[in-house]
Amino acid sequence: HTAAQDNCTCPTNKMTVCSPDGPGGRCQCRALGSGMAVDCSTLTSKCLLLKARMSAPKNARTLVRPSEHALVDNDGLYDPDCDPEGRFKARQCNQTSVCWCVNSVGVRRTDKGDLSLRCDELVRTHHILIDLRHRPTAGAFNHSDLDAELRRLFRERYRLHPKFVAAVHYEQPTIQIELRQNTSQKAAGDVDIGDAAYYFERDIKGESLFQGRGGLDLRVRGEPLQVERTLIYYLDEIPPKFSMKRLT
Amino acid sequence: HTAAQDNCTCPTNKMTVCSPDGPGGRCQCRALGSGMAVDCSTLTSKCLLLKARMSAPKNARTLVRPSEHALVDNDGLYDPDCDPEGRFKARQCNQTSVCWCVNSVGVRRTDKGDLSLRCDELVRTHHILIDLRHRPTAGAFNHSDLDAELRRLFRERYRLHPKFVAAVHYEQPTIQIELRQNTSQKAAGDVDIGDAAYYFERDIKGESLFQGRGGLDLRVRGEPLQVERTLIYYLDEIPPKFSMKRLT
């Protein structure tokens, strides 16, 4: 697996441990948390990244650790089970034997149940809508410049084939990026739209997953584009199954 | 209720309609959504603000409207029921007769049920932990300067009495602001910690609720402090009641 030879690091994933113990003394990198070997010439799967994130040592000793009774609106962080290819297993369970089904981006798509819950297949998220709001600027960005810049970003930084960026919509200050990728369209070696969206989300939050590439610096004709709010919507090939109770 | 007399606007709440029809032709402002009169010399309650937010016309016509099957991690936005004082009613229900109990900041604190669900009292959130991560800077901020600046901000911008800012913790790049306010401590006219935290949260997101006061501009000894991630934990006087299924 390609990794920076001389100093043996993984350019596409800083949440790795690398050593020159691959075939012929080649640099090999393993994801934290799972210990799985990763290909450093492309993005690491979201499942392995989440697992690494949950395994990272929590240092902040002098800070307050919220009580177990604290309420917070944050459903998306958990320690996932990944399959041998690094994809999310269709069924995820926690330590207290509560289980639920997820889609290919690891987002829950059923009510929670017990160990008897069955998730027959990993349902593919084939359409991702990234909804951003940018900070105020002197004027609106030029739509076609913005479109070109975001397509370039997804191609260069996240290695996502341009055909998977279906559209870029803009109505100041809202930008929407539509990623589409059916099971049939995704060829071997293609970056998954879910992984590209996750890297982008972490970049926007200033939590870049890349090693030594600096943070995301988004500019349209030299003008910085600073994002102040992000919402990501995931659409699955098969609609999710929730009871009425979810519909608030 | 105090409002800017001559141009009749509400400095503390832009989600209002104001007209000079108060006693003696004084400017009176009513919250959008509820039509309730608000006091423009202090913060408007979070319940009325959420109600106004949900009633605001959605314009963005050319943008994609996510399908009803789209998954998004965002549980905190709903159209609430507020009491005559503008506080959250203890029980909230949606159009499909799904009900749940909330705390004084409007965050769900029980599993969802049906119309038979009882919420005996509005449980007070007496401790709020605001967990921020700031953008990288040349060096760490001086802790006491940061502490003083955040206390000043809460006092000046949100009119929160300094005694309710219990502590400011800092371990670069994480900042934690602890707000504490028991039922017994809160006197008439005191700003509620939940309202102050909500205004702060909206300010951080670049969605200031103030009229004519500019966005939030946070500085420590002149150095801009830019927040890139916020998590808010709410602790209630009585712990929340969730079934085991919540514990993921």
């Epitope: 105020p136 | 007399q5 006061r213 500085r219």
Partner: antibody
Framework: QIQLVQSGPELKKPGETVKISCKAS????????MNWVKQAPGKGLKWMGW????????TYAEEFKGRFAFSLETSASTAYLQINNLKKEDTATYFC??????????????WGAGTTVTVSS | DIVMTQSHKFMSTSVGDRVSITCKAS??????VAWYQQKPGQSPKVLIY???YRYTGVPDRFTGSGSGTDFTFTISRVQAEDLAVYYC?????????FGAGTKLELK
């Protein structure tokens, strides 16, 4: 050190135009807004408005809408105040003042020395 | 617009005296009030912001207090170099407004 250097005094006739400059040094220009304050001879201070140095967006106080224009040359860390169709009542000292982007910092911690504009026929 | 009223146009004092200047806002401005000192032929200089916060390098004989609509600026022991005009300013909401000024002079 941090300073705002303003252009020199101006003597103009009614109906003419004047453009005053305010050059900032010693700090990141775009980290602060630039305010303009008028002081007529023997009178108090009057806020004219401010310009957002990040976006170039000006905000004018009601009294100064129309003939007054704020502008920037960001690459030169310079703000400008232009007054068109000068009137006798525009005779005053004009100060630029550094301030923040929100009300918590809408006081002026650094001031220029002032530019005196005299309008006389 | 918010009107800032400084009740005294002039105040007479002696070196070593304690002097207080008041400023009243026409509506509640939280604690968003600054105080400036201006000497003849000079630009104003900020002394206090947010009602009671002393600006960097300002001597501790200068203090401020108040909230809502009533504000006070105090010099605990007047020195000869303190003779100047003092202005209050609300930094709560635009348009930003100043008081008319209070001139501190020797008795």
């Amino acid at each position: 050190q941090i300073q705002l250097v303003q252009s020199g005094p101006e003597l103009k006739k009614p109906g003419e135009t004047v453009k005053i400059s305010c050059k900032a040094s010693g700090y990141t220009f775009t980290n602060y807004g630039m305010n303009w304050v008028k002081q007529a001879p023997g009178k108090g201070l009057k806020w004219m408005g401010w310009i957002n140095t990040k976006t170039g967006e000006p905000t004018y106080a009601e009294e100064f809408k129309g003939r007054f224009a704020f502008s920037l040359e960001t690459s030169a860390s310079t703000a400008y105040l232009q007054i068109n169709n000068l009137k006798k009542e525009d005779t005053a000292t004009y100060f630029c003042g550094r301030g923040g982007y929100g009300s918590s910092y809408w006081y002026f911690d650094v001031w220029g020395a002032g530019t005196t504009v005299t309008v006389s026929s | 617009d918010i009107v800032m009223t400084q009740s005294h146009k002039f105040m007479s004092t002696s070196v070593g005296d304690r002097v207080s200047i008041t400023c009243k806002a026409s509506q509640d401005v939280s604690i968003a009030v600054a105080w400036y000192q201006q000497k003849p032929g000079q630009s104003p200089k900020v002394l206090i912001y947010s009602a009671s916060y002393r600006y960097t390098g300002v001597p501790d004989r200068f203090t401020g207090s108040g909230s809502g609509t009533d504000f006070t600026f105090t010099i605990s022991r007047v020195q000869a170099e303190d003779l100047a005009v003092y202005y209050c300013q609300q930094h709560y909401i635009t348009p930003l407004t100043f008081g008319a000024g209070t001139k501190l002079e020797l008795k």
